[in-house]
């Protein structure tokens, strides 16, 4: 019963985690404009892995995709790759774990096969969670580096009096979603691995020997516990705008009070 609960909980936690990783990957708020010096701004910038957005005080939001692949920073590409790998592994892990669930009966699948699949999905969830945490952490590190670099050059004098303010970016909501989601996926994976141990049938290749000593009855089993991981020969393996003068009709921006484009 405890094994089923652990496995089921691990599955649910991992499912929530992977949904969070997908959400974080799709979110536009990976980095948001730092508002420390100006809490109320007329133009607010935020960026995601796939596009950057500008929300005006008027309520209009305009988002632009990164249509270049080669022109993007290597770090951003690496973060994208880590998140996608995390999602793919997580999705496969979910698929495997569905069949591994003790509460689901599929033909005459043995417990050893279910244990094997539970462990496989658990490892996949762990790697998926680590990929997400790594991706988010790499991006966060990139932000911190850029933040202090832009703080050093915050105001660049142009002809004495004129000042150009460099936009600084800080952690966006997606980073926190990613960290939490990665952590949940990781925890779910660990729970699946724990559940795998309970699912695995105990093998006893010996006879129990009883020793009787002065009034006490003690049973002694030599050899200790042997858990079948299912990777032996006895297992049955079962096999996601430009410049220039323009009229307003040429401008594509959308009002966004309720949702962000």
């Amino acid at each position: 019963m405890a094994v089923t609960a652990c496995q089921g909980l691990g599955f649910v936690v991992s499912l929530i985690g992977i949904a969070g990783i997908i959400a974080a990957t799709c979110m536009d708020q990976w980095s948001t404009q730092d508002l420390y010096n100006n809490p109320v701004t007329a133009v607010f910038n935020y960026q995601g892995l796939w596009r950057s957005c500008v929300r005006e005080s008027s309520g209009f939001t305009e988002c632009r995709g990164y249509f270049t692949l080669l022109g993007l920073p290597a770090m951003l590409q690496a973060v994208r790759a880590l998140m996608i790998v995390g999602i793919v592994l997580g999705a496969i892990g979910l698929l495997v774990s569905i069949f591994a669930l003790k509460c689901i009966r599929i033909g005459s699948m043995e417990d050893s096969a279910k244990a094997n699949m539970t462990l496989t999905s658990g490892i996949m969830f762990i790697v998926s969670g680590l990929c997400a945490i790594a991706g988010v952490s790499v991006f966060a590190n990139m932000l911190v580096t850029n933040f202090w670099m832009s703080t050093a050059n915050m105001y660049t004098g142009m002809g004495g009096m004129v000042q150009t303010v460099q936009t600084r970016y800080t952690f966006g909501a997606a980073l926190f979603v990613g960290w939490v989601a990665g952590g949940l996926t990781l925890i779910g994976g660990v729970m699946m691995c724990i559940a795998c141990r309970g699912l695995a049938p105990e093998e006893t290749n010996y006879k129990a020997v009883s020793y009787h000593a002065s009034g006490h009855s003690v049973a002694y089993k030599p050899g200790g516990f042997k858990a079948s991981t299912g990777f032996g020969s006895n297992t049955k393996n079962k096999k996601i705008y430009d410049g220039g003068a323009r009229t307003e009709d040429e401008v594509q921006s959308y009002p966004s009070k309720h949702d962000y484009v």
Epitope: N45, S57, S58, G59, E62, T164, V165
Partner: antibody, heavy 118, light 113 residues
Framework: QVQLVQSGAEVKKPGASVKVSCKAS????????MNWVKQAPGQGLEWIGN????????SYNQKFKGRVTLTIDKSTSTVYMELSSLRSEDTAVYYC???????????WGQGTTVTVSS | DIVMTQSPDSLAVSLGERATMNCKSS????????????LTWYQQKPGQPPKLLIY???TRKSGVPDRFTGSGSGTDFTLTISSLQAEDVAVYYC?????????FGGGTKVEIK
């Protein structure tokens, strides 16, 4: 069509308060921020502040903060600007204006003249 | 606060001639997020509220004649009336829409020579 209709001219004594209204029609009232602009006689334009009719959030020019209050009545699609502790330099035409792309003001009310005189 | 400085204060141009006025901001109005300049131009005729001509420094509002052209980037901006008409006699204001408080220039008065 979009229309912003403001209340009539007001004459007030120094130290008093004035509440100017701006009724919007012809568009989704909660979809656009409303701004207030002051124009003293023979002078230029001065931004007072704005209000988001959807959330009710406000932004004020520090120069007017503490003396000006912007409020809304969604049921009548009306925005109000209340200016307290009036002084002679508050004598001006006050405009309400709808905020558009680029934070520009695309539609303006006809203006309300407020005269502060003892 | 961003200070907007307009020049000249007044401008007398013959009908059909080109009228050019400038606007300088104390800080860049170019937003790095979308590479747009948050500068707006308005026209105000006596006894009337201002009328929006150009936003994002160069985008004409629909219904505005194409003789009105906005240009510039960063801190220096220009409004050009390619062929002045009698109805263009007015005061023209530029506005910072990038940073609060939103600020206006002192205005340029355009008259017929």
């Amino acid at each position: 069509q979009v229309q912003l209709v403001q209340s009539g001219a007001e004459v007030k004594k120094p130290g008093a308060s004035v509440k100017v209204s701006c009724k919007a029609s012809g568009y989704s009232f909660t979809g656009y921020n409303m701004n207030w602009v002051k124009q003293a006689p023979g002078q230029g334009l001065e931004w007072i502040g704005n209000i988001d009719p959807y959330y009710g959030g406000t932004s004020y020019n520090q120069k007017f903060k503490g003396r000006v209050t912007l409020t809304i009545d969604k049921s009548t699609s009306t925005v109000y600007m209340e200016l307290s502790s009036l002084r002679s330099e508050d004598t001006a035409v006050y405009y309400c204006a709808r905020m558009y792309h680029g934070n520009a003001f695309d539609y303006w009310g006809q203006g309300t003249t407020v005269t502060v005189s003892s | 606060d961003i200070v907007m400085t307009q020049s000249p204060d007044s401008l007398a141009v013959s009908l059909g001639e080109r009228a050019t006025m400038n606007c300088k901001s104390s800080q860049s109005l170019l937003n790095s997020g979308n590479l747009k300049n948050y500068l707006t131009w308005y026209q105000q005729k006596p006894g009337q509220p201002p009328k929006l001509l150009i936003y994002w420094a160069s985008t004409r509002k629909s219904g505005v004649p194409d003789r009105f052209t906005g240009s510039g980037s960063g801190t220096d901006f220009t409004l050009t009336i390619s062929s002045l008409q009698a109805e263009d006699v007015a005061v023209y204001y530029c506005q910072n829409d990038y940073s609060y408080p939103l600020t206006f220039g002192g205005g340029t008065k355009v008259e017929i020579k």
